[in-house]
Interface confidence: low
């Protein structure tokens, strides 16, 4: 007998062909031999069956040889085997509907766990591949977990669910709710105002919070509360801000903060945490900020930088036209007795220049 | 609809101690800074106390510091508010409030629990 | 601690009157203020936020303004429910602070 697979919620059409192209009597049945529809005279009639109301036939394609029965709105109880009788024929269908739904709410935190779970006829021995929208595949029975999920796993999985040869294919739409990036570094020469952007990787109708922006800065013994504030509706509403740096928050998604300038107290890490409502757990991102001064006092000429920078970015100063050049993998470089013009400062990364700063030297008379 | 219940309340003798408790209902209690607020008897508002939503800051107004210590369990939705060392001008009708979730005010209040510290 | 000085502390009105009550903060709070209703044997109430912001619910004809030290909290027109107490609270630094409060009685 020939098998089809189901899913819940769909439409499935078990067809049905008789030898001669016309218009005849026919008859469906379930494995009980309770009539669900068939042809009387002209008119498609229907039996006692629970199927009754969401059984329907094509009759535009009687005249062709085609009974096919179509079943809305597939429940997994309508799994059975469906005969279709025609010219003393009887023709055995096996109807197999599976259904896969996530065990949680579908809006999932970065590092929760995913649970799907297929529904199943008795009797079948279905088996599941998942795949998600980075290309990861995942294997498993009746149920399938993903113990931790990471931004890239946004998006749609395709699970496609086997059972005697035959597949039948469910997408699941997750969202992980994440910040786009998880660490991001700002550059800035002292003095200069500061941008921090946290987007984020989702969107939600309704987004509310609250967070708070940590920061320990390279100099201070311990890290401190920056800000703090709360989302509603996508709207932002500062609660606290720190007096010293005085940072201003945009009112809109994405999160925006402001640091008025960048001095070398502030350079060091952040982290933006945020805790949305009915979500347990919350949402990270870390940011850096390196600082970098350059300046001249009697007969030195130095450039330093504050901030989390990796032991391999270098730091330069160098005579604007001229060879003259002093680099060191270290946070400070100087140069004594400057030649007059036009300095740099550069901190680079492998030859990509990350921060700049020019000081002009005066000749000393 | 959000709800704050205070408990813990009653006649305690100077220089004892008494714990209260805030339950908190109707809104997700690890989201929000709780405050406690008092008022003695015909006298005006006095703010005590307020621990961030994660328990990682404290503040305290002076009259209470070295005294007081506030508290939650998340896990219970409850706040605490720990009183040592008690004096009779701690007398008063102690409300837990908490913030709104647009602005600063405290728009959220118990119904407030009576502290009488008398011999 | 700041100290909020609020004044004057009880004031007499009738019904239809437009009513005055001022705040002074001992140091800037730029906007940071709240303004409180409480009536007998309940809890206050939240009528403005950050000064001049009318919290969701609350009658429009309460009104408040003032930024840095001087703020002003401001019955239109009284009505038989606004007979309660009046509470300014400073909400820029910890320890918040309490006005001494304000008793709106009916003359």
């Known amino acids: 007998k020939k098998v089809v697979l189901g899913k819940k919620g769909d439409t499935v059409e078990l067809t049905c062909n008789a030898s001669q192209k016309k218009n005849t009597q026919f008859h469906w049945k379930n494995s009980n031999q309770i009539k669900i529809l068939g042809i009387q005279g002209l008119f498609l009639t229907k039996g006692p069956s629970k199927l009754s109301d969401r059984a329907d036939s094509r009759k535009s394609l009687w005249d062709q040889g085609c009974f096919s029965m179509i079943i809305k709105n597939l429940k997994i109880e309508d799994s059975d085997t469906y005969i279709c009788e025609v010219e003393n024929k009887k023709e055995e269908v096996e109807l197999l509907v599976f259904g896969l739904t996530a065990n949680s709410d579908t809006h999932l935190l970065e590092g929760q766990s995913l649970t799907l779970t297929l529904e199943s006829p008795p009797g079948s021995s279905p088996s599941v591949k998942c795949r998600s929208p980075g290309g990861k595949n995942i294997q498993g029975g009746r149920t399938i977990s993903v113990p931790q999920l990471e931004r890239q796993d946004s998006g749609t999985w395709t699970c496609t669910v086997s059972q005697d040869q035959k597949t039948v294919e469910f997408k699941i739409d997750i969202v992980v709710l994440a910040f786009q990036k998880a660490s991001s570094t700002v550059y800035k020469k002292e003095g200069e105002q500061v941008e921090f952007s946290f987007p984020l990787a989702f969107t939600l109708e309704k987004l509310t919070g609250s967070g708070e922006l940590w920061w320990q800065a390279e100099r201070a013994s311990s890290s401190k509360s920056w800000i703090t504030f709360d989302l509603k509706n996508k709207e932002v509403s500062v609660k606290r801000v720190t007096q010293d740096p005085k940072l201003q928050m945009g009112k809109k998604l994405p999160l925006h903060l402001t640091l008025p300038q960048a001095l070398p107290q502030y350079a060091g890490s952040g982290n933006l945490t945020l805790a949305l409502e009915a979500k347990t757990g919350k949402l990270h991102q870390e940011v850096n900020l390196v600082v970098m001064r350059a300046t001249q006092f009697q007969e030195n000429l130095t450039c330093e930088v504050w901030g989390p920078t990796s032991p391999k970015l270098t730091l330069s100063l160098k005579l604007e036209n001229k060879g003259a050049t002093v680099s060191k993998q270290a946070k400070a470089v100087w140069v004594l007795n400057p030649e007059a013009g036009m300095w740099q400062c550069l901190l680079s990364d492998s030859g990509q220049v990350l921060l700049e700063s020019n000081i002009k030297v005066v000749p000393t008379w | 609809q959000v709800q704050l219940v205070e408990s813990g309340g009653g006649v305690v003798q100077p220089g004892r101690s008494l714990r209260l408790s805030c339950t908190a209902s109707g809104f997700n209690f690890i989201n929000y800074g709780i405050h406690w607020v008092r008022q003695a008897p015909g006298k005006g508002l006095e703010w005590v106390t307020i621990?961030?939503?994660?328990?990682?800051?404290?503040y305290y107004a002076d009259s209470v510091k070295g005294r007081f210590a506030i508290s939650r369990d998340n896990s219970k939705n409850t706040l605490y508010l720990q009183m040592n060392s008690l004096r009779a001008e701690d007398t008063a009708v102690y409300y837990c409030?908490?913030?709104?979730?647009?602005?600063?005010?405290?728009?959220?209040w118990g119904q407030g629990t009576l502290v009488t510290v008398s011999s | 601690a700041i100290q909020m000085t609020q004044s004057p502390s009880s004031l007499s009105a009738s019904v239809g009157d437009r009513v005055t009550i001022t705040c002074r903060a001992s140091q800037d709070i730029r906007n940071d203020l709240g303004w409180y209703q409480q009536k007998p044997g309940k809890a206050p109430n939240l009528l403005i936020y950050?000064?001049?912001n009318l919290q969701s619910g609350v009658p429009s004809r309460f009104s408040g303004s003032g930024s840095g030290t001087d703020f002003t909290l401001t019955i239109s027109s009284l009505q038989p429910e606004d007979f309660a107490t009046y509470y300014c609270l400073q909400d820029s630094n910890y320890p918040r602070t309490f006005g001494q409060g304000t008793k709106v009685e009916i003359k």
């Open positions: 621990i961030w939503y994660d328990g990682s800051k404290k």
């Open positions: 409030a908490r913030e709104d979730d647009w602005n600063d005010g405290l728009a959220y």
């Open positions: 950050a000064a001049s």
